[in-house]
Interface confidence: low
């Protein structure tokens, strides 16, 4: 039950996180014009990864895409790439995790397969979250660098003159959305990985004789038994022994839900 809850919660948290990463990537407010101590603002500017917008004092807003790749900073291109990789990985992770959910039955899918899929999606969510956090952080660093360079330019222009119209940019809402979304995706991924440990069947096949008490009788068969410590589903003293004579290799190939060690 706890495993299902952890897996489900991890899925939901990751879903919210990836939705946030997509929203942040599409938002225009990655950087906004810093209005502090700036008396010469004809329009309010804000930029996204894909377009630049101006809002006039009248309230009219116009946005224009970046038409050239040459004029944009390499860092911006890197941020775009990181965010897209994060979205793609997250989307694939979501798709995989849907089929991995314990509460969803698809044919006769073994728990081991679900465990592997849960781990895969968890790792994808972790990488997706890290990509988003890295992308947003790179952009924030680019802004901070630009901000302080602009501040220096404003007060130390040519011949000591004041550069009144040099605009400085500061953090936009998309950065905070990106950080939070990346963090949520990362947490969701970790939860999926934790859930995977609970789903993964581990077993020990003893080469020697294994005994398993079941009610009043004791079943005995050399080489065909699996040891159970009682941590799994076998709490009602059900017989694990199925009576079929199988080799050790065959037993290992087909783990059941009772195979907890």
């Amino acid at each position: 039950m706890a495993v299902t809850a952890c897996q489900g919660l991890g899925f939901v948290v990751s879903l919210i996180g990836i939705a946030g990463i997509i929203a942040a990537t599409c938002m225009d407010q990655w950087s906004t014009q810093d209005l502090y101590n700036n008396p010469v603002t004809a329009v309010f500017n804000y930029q996204g990864l894909w377009r630049s917008c101006v809002r006039e004092s009248s309230g009219f807003t116009e946005c224009r895409g970046y038409f050239t790749l040459l004029g944009l900073p390499a860092m911006l291109q890197a941020v775009r790439a990181l965010m897209i990789v994060g979205i793609v990985l997250g989307a694939i992770g979501l798709l995989v995790s849907i089929f991995a959910l314990k509460c969803i039955r698809i044919g006769s899918m073994e728990d081991s397969a679900k465990a592997n899929m849960t781990l895969t999606s968890g790792i994808m969510f972790i990488v997706s979250g890290l990509c988003a956090i890295a992308g947003v952080s790179v952009f924030a660093n680019m802004l901070v660098t630009n901000f302080w360079m602009s501040t220096a330019n404003m007060y130390t222009g040519m011949g000591g003159m004041v550069q009144t119209v040099q605009t400085r940019y500061t953090f936009g809402a998309a950065l905070f959305v990106g950080w939070v979304a990346g963090g949520l995706t990362l947490i969701g991924g970790v939860m999926m990985c934790i859930a995977c440990r609970g789903l993964a069947p581990e077993e020990t096949n003893y080469k020697a004789v294994s005994y398993h008490a079941s009610g009043h009788s004791v079943a005995y068969k050399p080489g065909g038994f699996k040891a159970s410590t009682g941590f799994g589903s076998n709490t009602k003293n059900k017989k694990i022994y199925d009576g079929g004579a199988r080799t050790e290799d065959e037993v290992q190939s087909y783990p059941s839900k009772h195979d907890y060690v």
Epitope: P39, V40, V43, Q47, P73, T167
Partner: nanobody, 123 residues
Framework: QVKLEESGGGFVQAGGSLRLSCSAS????????MAWYRQAPGKERELIAA?????????KYAESVKGRFTIFGDYAKKTLYLQMNSLKPEDTGVYYC???????????????WGLGTQVTVSA
Amino acid sequence: QVKLEESGGGFVQAGGSLRLSCSASGSIFGITGMAWYRQAPGKERELIAAIGSGSAGNTKYAESVKGRFTIFGDYAKKTLYLQMNSLKPEDTGVYYCNAGLMTSQSYYSKPYWGLGTQVTVSA
């Protein structure tokens, strides 16, 4: 190619008036501010007037021109004006237009300068 071009300069008697214009051309997308600078012979370039949204509260002037000069802009036409009244001989100099412009090629607003227009005020 983004360009700022000043016009309206010339020779005027003290007490006269002039109106300077500064037109921005090229792939300009946004204007983050516009200003006029003056460079008198043998002196450093100094800010004389700057404008923001066009409201009186968002303009600033050097003390030497307050009450005589008026800066205003027509952002739709991407043009900045400087109306100069009650001109004095000390107003003589080259007047430069300065604007923070956003172009389709640049991510951030950058300051651009015009080549300047000469204003001569005779006593």
